[in-house]
């Protein structure tokens, strides 16, 4: 008789999840030799231990602490790029500007990027059928708690000038409910962080509005200022040109506003 299985509203664990995490770990430690001390089998065991045999709506940050410890990594605290709803451009940017880091440029972020996972209470099985949806099922699910944990730690590590890339094409350029708005903003350390600089990325080619005056950006400025952190904002009118100028800063067309 097949055992009854909880049906969740979200997609199930990414196929070949264990193999993917292990392979990503090995690849990351090769690309980043300063992390060559990491034992990827131990990393996978710690990752697995965070959610296997646990109810997927009852995961805590504490469950991920062994993984956090194994994945401890130093990134230059003044070279951190946060992002919200514009992941691809943020990643394209750090692939060119190699001394800056998004969360997904760190080991733990790299391991989990675009993956889904969950287990089942009292069984060692991984659930490949369905996993809890943050809205429809529960917020304390394995994926959401993981990103909340690593995002908090990443923001806490930041110092000096912290940059954030925001999507100017969205109705809420700054969304209080995003990971950036709900976790990272509130975990920047005022004693270490001098300024949060927002880069608002424009979508339309003819869009010349000053999106730094958007009400949601003003809301972000208010939250940041109340935390005794300075705020600045720049419009990136031409993201394609912006990336090109990061690649070739000496190009004569890169002196004008982008």
């Amino acid at each position: 008789v097949p055992r009854w299985r909880q049906q969740w509203s979200g997609p199930g664990t990414t196929k070949r999840f264990p193999e993917t995490v292990l392979a990503r770990c090995v690849k990351y430690t090769e690309i980043h030799p300063e992390m060559r001390h990491v034992d990827c089998q131990s990393v996978w065991d710690a990752f697995k231990g965070a959610f296997i045999s646990k109810h997927p709506c009852n995961i805590t940050e504490e469950d991920y602490q062994p993984l956090m410890k194994l994945g401890t990594q130093t990134v230059p605290c003044n070279k951190i790029l946060l992002w919200s709803r514009i992941k691809d451009l943020a990643h394209q940017f750090t692939q060119v500007q190699r001394d800056m880091f998004t969360l997904e440029d760190t080991l733990l972020g790299y391991l989990a990027d675009d993956l889904t996972w969950c287990g089942e209470f009292n069984t060692s099985k991984i659930n490949y059928q369905s996993c809890p949806d943050w809205r429809k099922d529960c917020s304390n699910n394995p994926v959401s708690v993981f990103w909340k944990t690593v995002s908090r730690r990443f923001a806490e590590a930041a110092c000096d000038v912290v940059h954030v890339m925001l999507n100017g094409s969205r109705s809420k350029i700054f969304d209080k409910n995003s990971t950036f708005g709900s976790v990272e903003v509130h975990n920047l350390q005022p004693e270490k962080v001098q300024t949060l600089e927002a880069w608002v990325i424009h979508g339309g080619r003819e869009d010349s509005r000053d999106l730094c005056q958007d009400p949601t950006i003003k809301e972000l400025e208010s939250i940041i200022s109340k935390r005794n952190i300075q705020f600045s904002c720049k419009n990136i009118y031409r993201p394609d040109k912006f990336l090109q100028c990061v690649k070739n800063p000496e190009d004569s067309s890169c002196t004008s506003e982008i």
Partner: antibody, heavy 113, light 113 residues
Framework: SVEESGGRLVTPGTPLTLTCTAS????????MSWVRQAPGKGLEWIGF?????ITYYASWARGRFTISKTSTAVDLKITSPTTEDTATYFC???????????WGPGTLVTVSS | AQVLTQTPSSVSAAVGGTVTINCQAS????????LSWFQQKSGQPPKLLIY???SLASGVPSRFSGSGSGTQFTLTISGVQSDDAASYYC?????????????FGGGTEVVVK
Amino acid sequence: SVEESGGRLVTPGTPLTLTCTASGFSLSSYYMSWVRQAPGKGLEWIGFISKTAITYYASWARGRFTISKTSTAVDLKITSPTTEDTATYFCARVDAYSAGDLWGPGTLVTVSS
Amino acid sequence: AQVLTQTPSSVSAAVGGTVTINCQASQSVYSDNRLSWFQQKSGQPPKLLIYSTSSLASGVPSRFSGSGSGTQFTLTISGVQSDDAASYYCQGEFICTSADCFVFGGGTEVVVK
């Protein structure tokens, strides 16, 4: 242990390949580094090769050297030697936390016309 | 590029005395502690003494010790013995994607009287 070979007298511009042979451990389990030392001078890191053959070079060494590996050896090619490349070349096994826990005795390269 | 500056370039010590060698990095080493010390005797390859700032490599006598963090590091030889006459090099590690992975200091010659 590790041992370097291939060092000799060459004329400027003549490519030269040095070989590092490992025994007692597998090259697929370690990064391997090349370091050089000009006569009477200090140590200079050239570059290293990862377990899966990804290479990293010192900024000054890029384009001047090529590191490659087989299952049994790691090679360092000096693409176009100049007199400044006269040095003893060391191969070292890179451990988890340092540039080398196991070094070869070195091989001397002399570049002279 | 990152630079590791070692001071002094040469130091003389009596048997039983103490030697202190300083190593200053132009930027913080990886994790604030990825700094190693090597000993090199004439005609020999370098030998790893200390890794991760203060951890003693296997078989290294406890009279060698390391300390420091970030950009400032020190190697101390307490109760110097005649066998300690050698050149000493610090070596820092940095994030490879944005800098040279490994950089050596210029070296310090220790003379034992």
